[in-house]
């Protein structure tokens, strides 16, 4: 299970991935319009220090659909 | 327990290219993040880059234009190649593993292997 | 120069408390990233310490100590050994480099 400001790494963060992601599929490196993060991505953000939920859906490949 | 060995040739010459293979036992190399680092000789530890399986890299960014990283998940293997080297390459090359047990710290290490760039 | 600085030498009595600094800065130990510290001893490989700033992998003796505060970081050795001579290197990922960044090793000295 995953708990606020945990972090994830290796198969873990693949593996929370596609749970929170579901079928929208997941990047590690978000889009290029977010260029002045660099190479900063869900395995910097995750697995070197803690991150949320929130943080995690961001790397989705589609927004969540709203109910 | 996943173990680490690190292989290539021990001398490159000036503008070569350097490659080096680590071959991993005792663990699936698609299960965690696999870094390359090294060591001038009398100096400290500088990292090279580190990758996961999927394809996702990062390198650092003074050898960026010159490394290059890939994985035979066939062979449970991963390689740098470092392009266009120079007495400065010389080193101790390390590979290391993130297993994700330690928060993103290198928990697993190669012996080293040695290399010197020299005509 | 390194991106996180390290003392280069420090000693101590067996027996004695010493503590090994490492500085950063906002993009890297100050912006939450974890710092790990590895010891490595001549012709070896650095061997992981500690592990997400305060943590000990199995077989590290309790005496081996991390903490993080702000923008620093410290490994604290208790009971120093003749054994715990060696280098010492703190490792962070710093955002503004977009990459890992050790700190340039401090070495232990045991005196005696």
């Known amino acids: 299970a995953y708990g606020p400001g945990e972090t994830l790494c290796g198969g873990e963060l693949v593996d929370t991935l596609q749970f929170v992601c579901s079928d929208r599929g997941f990047y590690f490196s978000r889009p290029s319009s977010r260029a002045n993060r660099r190479s900063r991505g869900i395995v910097e953000e995750c697995c070197f220090r803690s991150c949320d939920l929130a943080l995690l859906e961001t790397y989705c490949a589609t927004p969540a659909k709203s109910e | 327990q996943v173990q680490l060995q690190e292989s290539g040739p021990g001398l490159v010459k000036p503008s070569e290219t350097l490659s080096l293979t680590c071959t991993v036992s005792?663990?699936?190399?698609?299960?965690?993040?696999w870094s390359w680092i090294r060591q001038p000789p009398g100096r400290g530890l500088e990292w090279i880059g580190y990758f996961f399986y999927s394809g996702y890299t990062n390198y650092n960014p003074s050898l960026k234009s010159r490394v290059t990283m890939s994985v035979d998940t066939s062979k449970n293997q991963f390689s740098l190649k470092l392009s266009s080297v120079t007495a400065a390459d010389t080193a101790v090359y390390y590979c290391?593993?993130?297993?994700?047990?330690?928060?993103?710290?290198?928990?697993?290490w190669g012996q080293g292997a040695t290399v010197t760039v020299s005509s | 120069q390194s991106v996180l600085t390290q003392a280069p030498s420090v000693s101590g009595a067996p027996g004695q408390r010493v503590t090994i600094s490492c500085t950063g800065r906002?993009?890297?130990?100050?912006?939450?990233?974890?710092v790990h510290w590895y010891q490595q001893f001549p012709g070896t490989a650095p061997k992981l310490l500690i592990y997400?700033?305060?943590n000990r992998p199995s077989g590290v003796p309790d005496r081996f100590s991390g903490s993080k505060s702000g923008t620093s970081a410290s490994l604290a050795i208790t009971g120093l050994q003749a054994e715990d001579e060696a280098d010492y290197y703190c490792?962070?990922?710093?955002?503004?480099?977009?990459?890992?960044?050790f700190g340039g090793g401090t070495k232990l000295t045991v005196l005696g």
């Open positions: 906002s993009s890297n130990i100050g912006a939450g990233y974890d």
């Open positions: 290391a593993c993130i297993t994700g047990t330690t928060k993103g710290g290198m928990d697993v």
């Open positions: 490792q962070s990922y710093d955002s503004s480099l977009s990459g890992s960044v």
């Open positions: 997400g700033n305060s």
């Open positions: 005792g663990g699936s190399i698609s299960s965690y993040y």
